[in-house]
């Protein structure tokens, strides 16, 4: 018989981010003997699962196994065979599944059950699939970026390991934009967090953090677009919707049943005299911006100050990392540079949205039309959300850093999630001896 192969001196972890529009699998690696050190975990692979988000499989759950196969097989290739059985696998589902659960808890459970059965068939240490809360999504995103930026390290450095690092230990705020929700998380300056739902207390590496977080469900870029369409079709005189958020010359037919499928459009739902309508783009940034602002209710605030929809938001403080769709959209629009002012971003968005659709298609021939058509809306939405929603100003805009990766690891909630579940973020500064699990967050 064989002896159990001695594990490499490294460990691996897998996290699947089951988002509203797609699922991504991340593989992380770290030195086994340095688990409690900050900044030692890094991403070695990202695999994007082909197809939509898992919530779209509600009527075809039998296809979930095949859907996950390619990326799970990729994980088997990347991680040494001797490590497979010891490698934890976690799946976290976000706002797409939160919305499905709002519609039907039974359907959401059925999807998760099939996901769990599919993932448990692999030779890894499967630890479960669950819908994470918006608060968790915000918190883990904040942990991820600050862990990667070295903000939890007590050692002060005279050099900078990442472009955004300002040698102090002030943490970065986290701005996360998905398809179905958006999160804002940061440490406010000496400010009481007036609503308990938005308050988090952490003790990480010997330091206490009082963190504000909120997740706005239905305000991810895809659901925000559905909301805007549902709002605007209410006042359309016929089945033509002249839409400033799409390029001039762009046309698309939308089924009313698709529009009202999501819980996010319920507040705008009405009986329409047609089953379909046609979007006709007119490409006007200013009008698009105005239309988007109507999605934010700023007339009511039971606190000293709010973001929108009566949600408490403390005064913004410090630098922010804006990631996920904030980054992808701005990267496509070539607006991620630190040198581009908010005024310049607005100016460029005006020009971009005004470009004819035929011209846009020619300029970006390699991009799928479905995605390409929505960049004008998404870019405008990002500006509206950050400026009017979160109250960034032209001056504070320079404190927003659009971040895709930090030190080779994607910015997002998955790394923070794994660090927490594998007990790799000690509450106290690690000593030479490992700490008991009770001291972890």
């Amino acid at each position: 018989t064989q002896n159990k192969a001695l594990p490499e001196n490294v460990k691996y972890g897998i996290v699947l981010d089951a988002g509203s529009s797609h699922t991504s699998l991340y593989i992380y690696k770290w030195p086994a003997e340095k688990e409690n050190d900050t900044g030692v975990v890094h991403q070695v692979e990202e695999c994007r699962v082909k197809g939509p988000g898992i919530s779209k499989f509600v009527q075809k759950v039998n296809e979930i196994g095949i859907y996950l196969t390619d990326c799970m097989e990729r994980a088997r290739e990347v991680i040494p065979r001797s490590q497979h059985q010891e490698t934890p696998v976690y799946l976290g589902a976000t706002a797409g599944m939160r919305l499905l659960r709002m519609e039907s808890e039974e359907l959401a459970d059925r999807v998760l059950d099939v996901v769990e059965r599919s993932l448990s068939n692999y030779p890894f240490d499967f630890q479960g699939a669950r819908i994470i809360t918006g608060q968790e999504e915000g918190a883990y995103g904040w942990i991820t970026i600050n862990y990667l930026l070295g903000k939890f390290s007590q050692k002060t450095r005279w050099f900078s390991i990442v472009p955004y690092e300002t040698n102090n230990q002030e943490t970065f705020g986290a701005l996360d934009l998905g398809g179905a929700s958006t999160q804002v998380t940061f440490v406010p300056q000496n400010q009481t967090i007036e609503s308990p739902d938005n308050a988090l207390q952490f003790r990480l590496y010997g330091k206490d953090y009082n963190v504000y977080t909120h997740s706005f469900l239905c305000y991810g870029k895809d659901q925000a677009l559905w909301q805007k369409l549902a709002k605007d079709i209410q006042v359309a005189s016929n089945e033509i919707l002249r839409d400033p958020c799409f390029h001039p010359g762009y046309k698309k037919v939308v089924n009313v049943s698709d529009l009202y499928k999501t819980p996010c459009t319920k507040r705008f739902e009405m009986t329409l005299p047609f089953q379909q309508f046609e979007i006709q783009g007119i490409g006007n940034y200013q009008q698009c911006h105005q239309s988007i602002l109507e999605l934010f209710n700023t007339s009511y605030c039971p606190y000293s100050q709010c973001a929108f929809n009566g949600i408490f938001l403390p005064p913004l403080q410090g630098d922010f990392g804006a990631f996920s769709a904030f980054y992808f959209v701005m990267k496509f629009l070539n607006l991620t540079s630190e040198k581009v002012s908010q005024e310049k971003v607005t100016e460029m968005m005006k020009k971009f949205c005004a470009q004819p659709w035929e011209e846009i298609k020619t300029s970006y021939a390699g991009v799928k039309e479905k995605y390409l058509s929505e960049y004008c809306f998404s870019g405008t939405y990002i500006l509206s959300l950050l400026l009017q929603g979160y109250h960034f100003t032209a001056d504070s805009w320079e404190h927003i850093h659009f971040i895709g990766k930090i030190q080779g690891s994607d910015a997002g909630w998955t790394l923070g999630y794994m660090l927490n579940l594998t007990n790799m973020i000690p509450a106290e500064q690690p000593l030479s001896t490992p700490l008991s699990h009770s001291t972890y967050v």
Epitope: T1, Q2, N3, A5, S82, Q85, S120, P123, D125, F126
Partner: antibody, heavy 121, light 107 residues
Framework: EVQLVESGGGLVKPGGSLRLSCAAS????????MNWVRQAPGKGLEWVGE??????????HYAESVKGRFTISRDDSKNTLYLQMNSLKTEDTAVYYC????????????WGQGTTVTVSS | EIVLTQSPATLSLSPGERATLSCRAS??????LHWYQQKPGQSPRLLIY???QSISGIPARFSGSGSGTDFTLTISSLEPEDFAVYFC?????????FGGGTKLEIK
């Protein structure tokens, strides 16, 4: 010496139940995934199912032919693997082997001597 | 599920000859293919794992090759004790499956 010893086989009527045991020694039982494999008289080998570790919530997987009828369990404190067989059919007649892999996974480098189960009226 | 087809069903050879046993998978299983030997009245014994990895204590005349869907077990020079039934096994994905076996008999 690494050893697996099965017991509990015998003659049972169709529709009846039987519980097989497998006593493990010579290795840290709680650290290894355990399997049952069977072999009908004069036929090939058929994987019955597996049970994983406590850290995997004792997850089990089964062959389609036994799903819903057979249950694999383990008692790490007793170094023992079990196979509870209910609603037995004549086609379940076979020698049942307890197996494991002490290196990597999903192949079997340790086998018991087998225990015979006969389902007949 | 992955179906393994072994050929030939029976192979008649003499001691000293070279034996080549084949196993074909219904879909690609990389190198997750294992070989066993079983003698009458005995439990199976692992010969080769992951298509070509040898096991300590198994004579060097046994070797394995292949990847994807086609695999081969070779016994370079048959010894009298090698006449037995040989099974291949899918170790790639659940359910784990075995080939129908190749009976190696003395000519």
């Amino acid at each position: 010496e690494v050893q697996l010893v099965e017991s509990g086989g015998g003659l049972v009527k169709p529709g009846g139940s039987l519980r097989l045991s497998c006593a493990a020694s010579g290795f840290t039982f709680s650290k290894y995934w355990m399997n049952w494999v069977r072999q009908a008289p004069g036929k090939g080998l058929e994987w019955v199912g597996e049970i994983r570790l406590k850290s995997n919530k004792y997850g089990t997987h089964y062959a389609e032919s036994v799903k819903g009828r057979f249950t694999i369990s383990r008692d790490d404190s007793k170094n023992t693997l079990y196979l509870q067989m209910n609603s037995l059919k004549t086609e379940d007649t076979a020698v049942y082997y307890c197996t494991t892999q002490l290196d990597l996974y999903w192949f079997f480098d340790v086998w018991g001597q087998g225990t015979t189960v006969t389902v007949s009226s | 599920e992955i179906v393994l087809t072994q050929s030939p069903a029976t192979l008649s050879l003499s001691p000293g000859e070279r034996a080549t046993l084949s196993c074909r998978a219904s879909q690609s299983i990389s190198d997750y293919l294992h070989w066993y030997q079983q003698k009458p009245g005995q439990s199976p014994r692992l010969l080769i794992y992951y298509a070509s990895q040898s096991i300590s204590g198994i004579p060097a005349r046994f070797s394995g090759s292949g990847s994807g869907t086609d695999f081969t077990l070779t016994i370079s020079s048959l010894e009298p004790e090698d006449f037995a039934v040989y099974f291949c096994q899918n170790g790639h994905s659940l359910p784990l499956t075995f080939g129908g076996g190749t009976k190696l008999e003395i000519k």
